[in-house]
């Protein structure tokens, strides 16, 4: 069955935008004015996931690119990456678990918990121009809260 999807940008709670840093990495930095056009546009899709109150399973693709955020083990550590997919087969309702994030939405703030690695979240650093990563702590130095902005076509 088809599912709903939307186009959006994400900013962390310090208002840092997400931009491409090389072909397979995102970084977070403050943007202003025309530079805002650099920020990544996500295609966020509802997907099938495990049931849990106030968690909504989504996949985060890069709009009009065959790239999805995914969570894998690298050197025994949960790691966030951009993964190429076959555009003929994606997006789909039953995404592989590494592509699934549990969206937690409270007071217009969003968190994205890895379905593959519970309690690991899409995170940014306090510092400018650093990679977006998968972090295993919430409420510490690293930022796990985001806001979403619909993209007008």
């Amino acid at each position: 069955a088809p599912v709903r999807s939307l186009n959006c940008t994400l900013r962390d709670s310090q208002q840092k935008s997400l931009v491409m840093s090389g072909p397979y990495e995102l970084k977070a930095l403050h943007l202003q004015g025309q530079d805002m056009e650099q920020q990544v546009v996500f295609s966020m899709s509802f997907v099938q996931g495990e049931e849990s109150n106030d968690k909504i399973p989504v996949a985060l693709g890069l709009k009009e690119k065959n790239l999805y955020l995914s969570c894998v083990l690298k050197d025994d550590k949960p790691t966030l990456q951009l993964e190429s997919v076959d555009p003929k087969n994606y997006p789909k309702k039953k995404m592989e678990k590494r592509f699934v994030f549990n969206k937690i939405e409270i007071n217009n703030k969003l968190e994205f918990e890895s379905a593959q690695f519970p309690n690991w979240y899409i995170s940014t650093s306090q510092a400018e121009n650093m990679p977006v990563f998968l972090g295993g702590t919430k409420g510490g130095q690293d930022i796990t809260d985001f806001t979403m902005q619909f993209v007008s076509s």
């Epitope: 088809p2 109150n53 909504i56 902005q149």
Partner: antibody, heavy 119, light 107 residues
Framework: EVQLVESGGGNVQPGGSLRLSCTAS????????MAWVRQAPGKGLEWVGI???????YYASWAKGRFTISRDNSKNTVYLQMNSLRAEDTATYYC?????????????WGQGTLVTVSS | EIVMTQSPSTLSASVGDRVTITCQAS??????LSWYQQKPGKAPKLLIY???TLASGVPSRFSGSGSGTEFTLTISSLQPDDFATYYC??????????FGQGTKLTV
């Protein structure tokens, strides 16, 4: 106070068109998913459609082609454009905000606006 | 498209009664099921989402259960304010959203 107010309802002849508005106060509509739901007199609730960004709209099968949802974030307003109206479109039309993106449930509703299609 | 079927269509009960309304989905919707209460001339009010989670401000006498295709709404002890029409609705991010036909709860 957080609320939604619908307007634009009224009498229209079969085959005519009408545009309903839903204006938010107390919050910004710009990043809210907004749906329209209708209710014919004495009948049950019927989902019309939902809008996320302006390119991401979804409709009930019966509404596709005749009904269009759009938004104007600068006016904090969502619209329902209804064309080729029929007697069976007579209903109270509600706008509602999705509780969370893709939750598919609606925690905030307007008071509704009545559309009557009759010659 | 998913079809939601409620039973009964009408239900007579008294203050203090325990009442149960059932909702059946034509295909599995996991736990993506919501319940609403509507009073005459008013907009619907969200009672329960994700099959069993109470919406903000809803009294604890309301409860929901079920998953897959079979769901129930229970009011443990009816209060005068509870006489209304109740609707189930499949939720989540599927393209199609549908409401049940409603259950009118009368004195």
């Amino acid at each position: 106070e957080v609320q939604l107010v619908e307007s634009g309802g009224g009498n229209v002849q079969p085959g005519g068109s009408l545009r309903l508005s839903c204006t938010a106060s107390g919050f910004s509509l710009s990043n809210s998913a907004m749906a329209w739901v209708r209710q014919a007199p004495g009948k049950g609730l019927e989902w019309v459609g939902i809008i996320y960004d302006s390119a991401s709209t979804y409709y009930a099968s019966w509404a596709k082609g005749r009904f269009t949802i759009s938004r104007d974030n600068s006016k904090n307003t969502v619209y329902l454009q209804m064309n080729s109206l029929r007697a069976e479109d007579t209903a109270t039309y509600y706008c509602a905000r999705e509780r969370a993106i893709f939750s598919g449930d609606f925690a905030l509703w307007g008071q509704g606006t009545l559309v009557t299609v009759s010659s | 498209e998913i079809v939601m079927t409620q039973s009964p269509s009408t239900l007579s009960a008294s203050v203090g009664d325990r009442v149960t309304i059932t909702c059946q989905a034509s295909q599995s919707i996991s736990s993506w099921l919501s319940w609403y209460q509507q009073k005459p001339g008013k907009a619907p009010k969200l009672l329960i989402y994700k099959a069993s989670t109470l919406a903000s401000g809803v009294p604890s006498r309301f409860s929901g259960s079920g998953s897959g295709t079979e769901f129930t709404l229970t009011i443990s002890s009816l209060q005068p304010d509870d006489f209304a029409t109740y609707y189930c609705q499949n939720a989540g991010g599927g393209v199609s959203i549908a409401f049940g036909q409603g259950t009118k709860l009368t004195v």
